[in-house]
């Protein structure tokens, strides 16, 4: 049965031009983490495998950083930037759990600055 | 076109140390982990390890933890592949690989260095 | 470690066959894994990647199928430049296990 939940940043808005960092956490259970894909629609940005270390999708190495922990840090932020995130953590034994963060990104600078996880 | 060429074969002794180079090109050398994975004759196919060209970082087999060493020069686009107290059983052809874009297989190989380990 | 058990180890054919090589993974893989071609004296070649997308260059006739523990490649219509060894790989867990092959032979 799985019992746990993901806690994610939520709905979060950032400045054109600047980094932000997507963040879930996985709680309320005792499943072992085996990997964690980080996707964007349906294009992969970047896996952290517990064995294996991280993989960052070429086409977006240049602007995403591995961490802080299992999150990613996207960087140089565009417009075209603004959309659905998803972390999906690979447990063992429960199976897969999924979290979504929305993100928009502001051509102005009053980006609201609410996000827990965000870097200024 | 994507090109992965390997160093020539060696033979040596047990206890001696070899080390592979494998060189790319027709990518953009950072952008992609390189691995080594080998193969005894008449075999199958066994990993080895994966290296960052960009950070250096290296993921090591648990089994080869304690003798192999994985390297990069940047400025060659060429990544080696040493292992150390070589033994008889490491009698293999030695494959360097390039990390696909989705995920830890394989999706460009060099041709092969045919290590032999004899006395 | 995650085993990856191919099966048959060799099988024979013809021109023109439909041909299905199975793989078994000792626990849940997802849909992460990878098939690989090699002929005699040469590198292996990746055909397909997540169990089902087929790699850049990979005939039609090649596909891929399954998740979680049982996998299947199909050769839809077996052509001479088929015949080679096939190989499985889960690519998403140390130490990157590879199944024992199943060698393609003529007829």
């Known amino acids: 049965m799985m019992t746990g939940t993901i806690e994610t940043t939520g709905n979060i808005s950032a400045e054109k031009g600047g980094s932000i960092i997507l963040q879930c956490h996985l709680s309320s259970t005792t499943a072992q983490v085996t990997q964690v894909n980080w996707e964007q629609q349906d294009q992969l940005l970047a896996i952290c495998n517990a064995d294996l270390g991280w993989h960052i999708s070429p086409s977006f190495k240049d602007r995403v950083a591995p961490g802080p922990g299992l999150g990613l840090t996207l960087q140089s932020l565009t417009v075209n930037d603004t959309g659905e995130y998803f972390c999906i953590y690979h447990t063992y034994p429960d199976g897969t759990y999924t979290g979504r963060i929305f993100l928009e990104v502001l051509e102005s600078s009053v980006a609201e600055h609410g996000a827990r996880f965000q870097i200024p | 076109e994507v090109q992965l060429v390997q160093s020539g074969a060696e033979v040596k002794k047990p206890g001696a140390s070899v080390k592979v180079s494998c060189k790319a090109s027709g990518y953009t050398f950072t952008n992609y982990w390189m691995h080594w994975v080998r193969q005894a004759p008449g075999q199958g196919l066994e990993w080895m390890g994966r290296i960052d060209p960009d950070s250096t970082g290296s993921k090591y087999n648990e089994k080869f933890k304690t003798r192999v060493t994985m390297t990069v020069d940047t400025s060659t686009s060429t990544v080696y592949m040493e292992l150390s107290s070589l033994r008889s059983e490491d009698t293999a052809v030695y494959y360097c690989?390039?990390?696909?874009?989705?995920?830890?297989?394989?999706?460009?190989w060099g041709q092969g260095t045919l290590v032999t380990v004899s006395s | 470690d995650i085993q990856m058990t191919q099966s048959p180890s060799s099988l024979s054919a013809s021109v023109g066959d439909r041909v299905t090589i199975t793989c078994r993974a000792s626990e849940n893989i997802y849909s992460y894994l990878a098939w690989y071609q090699q002929k005699p004296g040469k590198s292996p070649k990746l055909l397909i990647y997540?169990?089902?997308t087929l790699a850049e260059g990979v005939p039609s006739r090649f596909s891929g199928s399954g998740s979680g523990t049982d996998f299947t490649l199909t050769i839809s219509s077996l052509q001479p430049e088929d015949f080679a060894t096939y190989y499985c790989q889960y690519h998403s867990g140390s130490p990157l296990p590879f199944g024992g092959g199943t060698k393609v032979e003529i007829k």
């Open positions: 997540n169990a089902r």
């Open positions: 690989a390039r990390e696909g874009a989705y995920g830890y297989y394989f999706d460009y």
